[in-house]
Interface confidence: low
């Protein structure tokens, strides 16, 4: 295992005294119920904590909630329940925090049964003050902020009305009835589905998709026979019922629904589903469920228009029961994703791609690990990562994999080493190169978090017993120090640090239990004195991402370019600081076949970079639907991977001709669309 507190590890000097001076306890004057925590704004230090306690009485449930505010990253809290008139807040709606640094907060109150509408409390000054507003409807969903303008809110009512506010919830207007699902698009556009006859459930597959670009003054019907819709990156997707049977197909639009193209994806039946796993402005990862209750499907990756898809990964685990998938975007390195597949023997194995789904491989076995009982060959096995599925199966896995964009290359996850994911107690593994190589970081399950852009990693052992010890590392998990943060152990419930991993504060949440009572308690530890000085140029080293063969001129080329990063040396104990910006130097690569996906009608045989024609399409004209017209594709089997920036080198031919024919199977052709005004 990774070296602990031994000769190899230089101890951080006097850390106990430094941390003791920066450990702040807060005991909440509450009976233990549930607690939720939200950060308000970025780098503001403002945290809101809502505690709720339910007392089931004979005829009703009595609820009590309290609201606390901190403006110093959780070191001190003030009870501000009086600002919301001591009202009971509905926890299922959470705290609706406004986008960016708007400082806006909406809390939804519990109201008595006979009331005309709901009640909200609004703040636009980072929760210093709240305004009570009675609503003309009962909300069904949390208030949703427009990403472009935090004064614009939308909500669905319990009677399926779509309500919009243009003045941050002060005044509300019902812009449409019979609405099933509503989402903000770009430029303050709202997309929503409506039912005509009975209900959302009864009309599934017969819904209409509408759009308003002026907050409900006018509408355009942009789709009919809709089952569902979704937004991902710059793509709008709709699953549409086929005319003749119960199957449905995905259609895609890149112009907010004005024109649609049928995605070249398999149609699905009643029991199957589509799922957008990840999307950016370049491309989409789409999961298509397999027929039957198999628990797996296929991942497809799209072209830059979201229309033509390549098969990326077979037997991708995605349970229909709980809707669990392990698909994880490794945000600390471009192009890297991790997920699980269900193998033929029904065991679950982890796969990783470094090139945005072009090729998937097993994770390399960590140097310092033995193969476990799942391995047929004790010398050859892989690392398998526990994610959402393991957590849903109640395995001893307290956290999903963790990566942060500003902690370059770092990935932390629970895992086991063998031929498949194991049900045995997992250990924690770390990669410092975006998933290429792994090391066992901690024995047994832990909670973990990244502070100061990777300068500090903090962990707490997952235990059923009360705890009072926190572990931290200043060298990306190689060496660990332990700090006893309280004499009286607490029942640990969670670690909280400011999103974005730039903070140096960590809050440990839990509760104390005595003979008669139990109370919420938090300990906030500031690591600023551990990292005494600001990092300088000498503390950083140049690192080439995706490097596998330094002798190769193309080493590090992924999606047509390579990137060199300045990364903190493991031996440097210093502050990256809140203003730290990842420094990277990109350089363009020559094009090779690796920069091209297989085109529609082509596939890559295993361990081959060449695309070959699908046998069932050999000799057939390759035709597909584009904007409701049939297109003819002339191709030698390749298309540029979306987002690939390579230049020169290999350049396969690709040409698309308009066949001037209508696609009969495109249900979202422009002539089926109409506009309405209020």
């Amino acid at each position: 295992s990774a070296p602990g507190e031994d000769e190899e590890c230089g101890r951080v000097r006097d850390f106990v005294a430094k941390l003791a001076n920066n450990t702040h306890q807060h005991v909440f004057d509450d009976l233990r119920g549930s607690v939720s925590l939200s950060w308000v704004g970025d780098s503001t230090g403002v945290i809101l904590v809502l505690t709720t306690f339910h007392v089931p009485l004979v005829i009703m449930t009595f609820g009590q909630s309290k609201l606390y505010r901190s403006e110093d990253y959780g070191k001190n809290f003030k009870d501000i329940t009086d600002l919301i008139n001591n009202t009971f807040i509905r926890t299922e709606f959470g705290m609706a925090i406004g986008p960016e640094n708007s400082g806006k907060v909406v809390l939804t109150a519990e109201v008595s049964g006979g009331s005309r509408g709901g009640r909200i409390f609004r703040s636009s000054d980072f929760a210093k003050n709240f305004v009570q507003t009675d609503l003309p409807f009962h909300p069904l969903t949390q208030m949703m902020y427009s990403p472009q303008n935090s004064d614009y809110l939308l909500a669905l009512s319990t009677e399926n009305g779509l309500w919009v506010s243009k003045n941050f919830g002060g005044k509300w207007e019902e812009i449409h009835k019979a609405v099933c699902l509503a989402k903000w698009g770009s430029d303050n556009t709202i997309f929503f589905t409506t039912y005509a006859n009975g209900s959302c459930k009864a009309d599934l597959g017969a819904l209409e998709l509408w759009r308003t670009s002026d907050l409900g003054k006018s509408f355009k019907t942009i789709g009919v026979k809709i089952y569902s819709f979704g937004l991902g990156g710059r793509f709008l997707f709709a699953s549409v019922m086929a005319d003749k049977d119960t199957t449905r197909r995905i259609h895609v639009s890149t112009d907010q629904g004005d024109t649609w193209s049928m995605a070249q994806l398999p149609s699905v039946g009643q029991e199957q589903f589509y799922s957008i796993l990840a999307a950016n402005d370049d491309m989409v990862f789409m999961h298509v469920d397999e027929p039957g209750d198999t628990g797996f499907g296929t991942i497809f990756t799209s072209d830059d228009r979201g229309i033509v898809y390549s098969k990326s990964l077979d037997r991708h685990l995605y349970t229909t029961t709980g809707g669990e998938t392990d698909f994880t975007n490794v945000t600390s390195l471009r192009g890297v994703y991790i997920t699980s597949v269900l193998s033929e023997d029904n065991s679950i194995q982890t796969m990783i791609t470094f090139d945005q789904g072009g090729r998937w491989t097993h994770l390399r076995k960590p140097e310092n690990s033995e193969c476990d009982a799942t391995a047929k060959n004790k010398n050859e096995c892989s690392l398998h990562i526990h994610a959402s599925y393991s957590i849903s199966q109640k395995l001893n896995v307290p956290m999903a994999p963790l990566s942060e964009p500003n902690a370059v290359g770092i990935v932390i996850a629970h895992g086991s080493v063998g031929d498949a994911i194991s049900v045995m107690v997992p250990d924690v593994y770390i990669s410092d190169d975006g998933g290429y190589s792994w090391t066992k970081m901690l024995e047994g399950p832990h909670y973990y978090t990244i502070l100061d852009s990777g300068g500090i990693i903090v962990a707490i052992e997952h235990s059923s017993r009360p705890i009072n010890v926190i572990k931290f590392s200043t060298d990306e998990g190689q060496c660990w120090q332990t700090y006893t943060f309280t004499r009286d152990p607490i029942y640990f419930t969670g670690l909280a640090s400011e999103p974005g991993a730039r903070s140096m504060n960590i809050s440990i949440w839990g509760f104390t239990e005595s003979f008669l009572t139990s109370q919420w308690v938090s300990y906030t530890i500031d690591f600023k004195d551990i990292l005494e000085r600001n990092c300088e140029e000498k503390d950083y080293t140049i690192w080439l991402a995706h490097s596998t063969d330094p002798e190769d001129y193309e080493d590090g080329c992924i999606l047509g370019y390579k990137e060199q990063f300045l990364r903190l040396r493991k031996s440097s104990v210093c502050q990256n600081g809140r203003d730290y910006v990842v420094t990277k130097q990109p350089s363009i690569c020559l094009c090779s076949l690796e920069d091209f996906l297989c085109d529609f009608g082509y596939y890559r045989p295993e361990n081959d970079s060449k695309c070959v024609e699908q046998p069932e399409l050999k000799g057939h004209d390759l035709e597909f639907c584009l904007y409701g017209r049939e297109e003819h594709l002339t191709t030698n089997g390749y298309r540029k991977i979306p987002g690939d920036k390579c230049q020169g080198g290999v350049n396969p031919v690709r040409e698309v001709k308009d066949l001037k024919k209508k696609c009969t199977s495109n249900f979202l052709s422009p002539e089926k669309q109409n506009s309405k005004s209020n």
């Epitope: 797996f296 033929e344 199966q393 049900v423």
Partner: antibody, heavy 126, light 107 residues
Framework: QVQLVQSGAEVKKPGASVKVSCKAS????????MHWVRQAPGQGLEWMGS????????NYAQKFQGRVTMTRDTSISTAYMELSRLRSDDTAVYYC???????????????????WGQGTTVTVSS | EIVMTQSPATLSVSPGERATLSCRAS??????LAWYQQKPGQAPRLLIY???TRATGIPARFSGSGSGTEFTLTISSLQSEDFAVYYC?????????FGGGTKVEIK
């Protein structure tokens, strides 16, 4: 459709061996574990062991260890269970059953046994 | 090994009534539990897996609940074809073990 067809009834003397076959059809034989379960007259179900047709790996209940051998022939999608040194209390109906799951791998669903053979009656009598 | 205990051994119920069968594991099996129905002269039939998920083709009157060590199979309104022996089985660990069975008979 998915089915498991077992070999016919057997009458054996104490000390002998019996080999029961179970032919799978309608699904990928190597994709699912095959379990063997027996039921003595008027008694409950007793799990004997399982085989992973993909790797040939086996798991036997302690009680049958050393007496039971489970094998498979993937070319004809057939699993076999051989029980040696038979005693009169081995008289039972022996079932093969398709299952999903394993001790050490997190296998999707841990179904239990979703498809069963019709059963093979083995009578041990002198 | 994990010992599975079913109760009661016999349950007498009238058609149309509700039947509740219990199964207890000697240690936690999470939700890795299956229920089977067996009629005389027939092979067992999978009813419930994952403690609560009905197998394909099983009527909605059958429902499973529980997790850890305590599990319940409920038949909401007994039909004539439901009179049979019911077994629970843990599928969390080897050896897979069955409960002794509960016979549901006509009252």
């Amino acid at each position: 459709q998915v089915q498991l067809v077992q070999s016919g009834a057997e009458v054996k003397k104490p000390g002998a061996s019996v080999k029961v076959s179970c032919k799978a059809s309608g699904y990928t034989f190597t994709g699912y574990y095959m379990h063997w379960v027996r039921q003595a007259p008027g008694q409950g179900l007793e799990w004997m062991g399982s085989i992973n047709p993909n790797s040939g790996g086996t798991n036997y209940a302690q009680k049958f260890q050393g007496r039971v051998t489970m094998t498979r022939d993937t070319s004809i999608s057939t699993a076999y269970m051989e029980l040696s040194r038979l005693r009169s209390d081995d008289t039972a109906v022996y079932y093969c059953a398709r299952g999903v799951g394993s001790t050490v791998t997190l296998a999707y669903y841990y179904y239990g046994m979703d498809v069963w053979g019709q059963g093979t009656t083995v009578t041990v009598s002198s | 090994e994990i010992v599975m205990t079913q109760s009661p051994a016999t349950l007498s119920v009238s058609p149309g009534e509700r039947a509740t069968l219990s199964c207890r594991a000697s240690q936690s099996v999470s939700s890795n539990l299956a229920w089977y129905q067996q009629k005389p002269g027939q092979a067992p039939r999978l009813l419930i897996y994952g403690a609560s998920t009905r197998a394909t083709g099983i009527p909605a009157r059958f429902s499973g609940s529980g997790s850890g060590t305590e599990f319940t199979l409920t038949i909401s309104s007994l039909q004539s074809e439901d009179f049979a022996v019911y077994y629970c089985q843990q599928v969390a660990n080897y050896p897979r073990t069955f409960g002794g069975g509960t016979k549901v008979e006509i009252k």
